[in-house]
């Protein structure tokens, strides 16, 4: 009688994770007596995978019915595949021996390999605030997925990036793999509604990419620009003056007007204005007593953004019978009309 | 649901034997290796050996070679353990169990004079 | 034979406490037959954790497992009252099969 041989027919076989895989084994004969193991790996470092006699295998279940007189077909059915169950399987049989069972002969193995998809890119920016014309980096991050091959796109408002970095980890054989991916953005004063988007695509997502998307409302800050304008007389000893804050982003700011160097009042400013391109504008004016003053009175309008150092403005009202225009914004005398607010 | 029924206690005296049965359900023996165990009181487990009962082949540890046979009957669906020349060293809970995951509820042998 | 070597023989935790038991053999196990077994006083001895580091169904994630060759370990991250039994290690990597002489776990 011919020796046993054991047949694996499939040399290799792709699984999606979650999925089950079956492992084909056959015998081409009875003799010796001897149970059936499968391991996954050989040497003596191999991990026993089941074994038909004994021990505690849950996820493991056989396709055909091993008790059956005289079955050969010693395939097995793996449920709930995981990266980590990727390996070379082997299908070996052993004939009953003292005081262990002695292998007899192994099946030439089948190379389980497990497709998983990559986790969804999560998008992460800089940890401080920037203002335009300043390079900020946007880091995305997708876990493991299997193969290794995969693809990884940057885009600003739908135009793709060209400076980035990606690495793919690690660089030997793995169960499974991690993208890592470092973008440059350039601000703009535009960018409050803008959107970086990392976009990764794999062969288990079937031409769908997955993305990820960081909104630079949370990394840009816009500086105000500030003017200080005199409006006309209210009343005969009254001076109104307005300082516009304009094009800010985000929306926190806090404004005190200064007389002389004195605080006069200070304000946090709510009912903003928003702009088309997502910035803020913003009017704070002051009520200025020209009799209560001898001399002339220097007006700052001073300006604090998202706890920024201040910015400010000033404006120098003359206290005279006939005030001409003053300050360094050169804004209106008491008795000319100013440019309307925005 | 697997289920390993084992008959109940057992008190003999000094040098007789005894035979503990272990009746499965919810799966054939034939399958599973069929193991026993003892178990002093308060003590550790000891492995004594294992059947497998679609060929009746077995295996002991060397300390209970001669002491223990272990036998099968497919038929019934049971696995034995006999036990010979009992002494005081004897005296313990038996288990069987079903290839080393499930386990029966054990049988209390008490060997007194 | 392969003899197992367990320690603590005996050893009590708080709850919440991190509690590791020790599994030493005397020559080299592979990690797919090292098993571990809870027992509780009245009961059989029940299949806890398998090929090292794989919990038995309906056995609580604070348990772990590790190691190789000859060096094993069981952990409860977080110690419960429920928890509080003996713990056996067993092989069956080669004939004899033999288990450890337990570790007794009481809680505090």
């Known amino acids: 009688e011919e020796e046993l041989q054991v047949i694996q027919p499939d040399k290799s076989i792709s699984v999606a994770a979650g999925e089950s895989a079956t492992l084909h084994c056959t015998v081409t004969s009875l003799i010796p007596v001897g149970p059936i193991q499968w391991f996954r790996g050989a040497g003596p470092g191999r991990e026993l995978i089941y074994n038909q006699k004994e021990g505690h295998f849950p996820r493991v279940t056989t396709v055909s019915d091993l008790t059956k007189r005289n079955n050969m077909d010693f395939s097995i059915r793996i449920s709930n595949i995981t990266p980590a169950d990727a390996g070379t399987y082997y299908c070996v049989k052993f004939r009953k021996g003292s005081p262990d069972h002695v292998e007899f002969k192994s099946g030439a193995g089948t190379e389980l390999s497990v497709r998983a998809k990559p986790s969804a890119p999560v998008v992460s920016g800089p940890a401080a605030r920037a203002t335009p014309q300043h390079t900020v980096s946007f880091t995305c991050e997708s876990h493991g997925f299997s193969p290794r091959d995969i693809t990884l796109k940057w885009f600003k408002n739908g135009n793709e990036l060209s400076d980035f970095q990606t690495n793919v980890d690690p660089a030997g054989d793995s169960v499974s793999y991690s993208i890592h991916s470092t973008a440059k953005v350039v601000l703009t004063r535009e960018d409050v509604h803008s959107q970086v988007i990392c976009e990764v695509a794999h062969v288990t997502l079937q031409g769908d990419p997955l993305r990820g998307t960081a909104n630079l409302s949370e990394t840009i800050r816009v500086p105000p620009t500030l003017e200080v304008t005199q409006q006309p007389v209210r009343a005969e000893n009254q001076v109104n003056v307005t300082c516009q804050v304009r094009k800010f982003y985000p929306q926190r700011l806090q404004l005190t007007w200064l007389e002389n160097g004195n605080v006069s009042r200070t304000e946090t400013a709510s009912t903003l204005t928003e702009n088309k391109d997502g910035t803020y504008n913003w009017m704070s004016w002051l009520l200025v007593n020209v009799s209560a003053h001898r001399d002339d009175v220097k007006l700052t309008c001073q300006v604090e953004h998202d706890g920024q150092p201040a910015v400010s403005k000033s404006h120098d009202l003359k206290v005279s019978a006939h005030p001409k225009e003053q300050g360094s914004n050169t804004a209106p005398g008491p008795a000319l009309a100013s440019a309307a607010p925005l | 649901e697997v289920q390993l029924q084992q008959s109940g206690a057992e008190l003999v005296k000094p040098g007789a034997s005894v035979k503990l049965s272990c009746t499965a359900s919810g799966f054939n023996i034939k399958d599973y290796y069929m193991h026993w165990v003892k178990q002093r009181t308060e003590q550790g487990l000891e492995w004594i050996g294992r059947?497998?009962?679609?060929?009746?082949?077995?295996k002991y540890a060397p300390k209970f070679q001669g002491k223990a046979t272990i036998t099968a009957d497919t038929s019934s669906n049971t696995a034995y353990l006999q036990l010979s020349s009992l002494t005081s060293e004897d005296t313990a809970v038996y288990y069987c169990?079903?290839?080393?995951?499930?386990w029966g509820q054990g049988t209390l042998v008490t060997v007194s004079a | 034979q392969i003899v197992l070597t367990q320690s603590p023989a005996i050893m009590s935790a708080s709850p919440g406490e991190k509690v590791t038991l020790t599994c030493s053999a005397s020559?080299?196990?592979?990690?797919?037959?090292l098993y571990w077994y809870q027992q509780k006083p009245g009961s059989s001895p029940k299949l806890w954790i398998y090929?090292?580091?794989n919990l038995a169904s309906g056995v609580p994630a604070r348990f772990s497992g590790s190691g190789s060759g000859t060096s094993y370990s069981l952990t409860i991250s977080s110690m419960e009252a429920e928890d509080a039994a003996s713990y056996f290690c067993h092989q069956w990597s080669s004939y004899p099969y033999t288990f450890g002489g337990g570790t007794k776990l009481e809680i505090k």
């Open positions: 059947i497998d009962p679609e060929d009746g082949e077995t």
């Open positions: 090929s090292t580091s």
């Open positions: 169990d079903r290839g080393l995951a499930y």
């Open positions: 020559s080299s196990v592979s990690s797919s037959y």
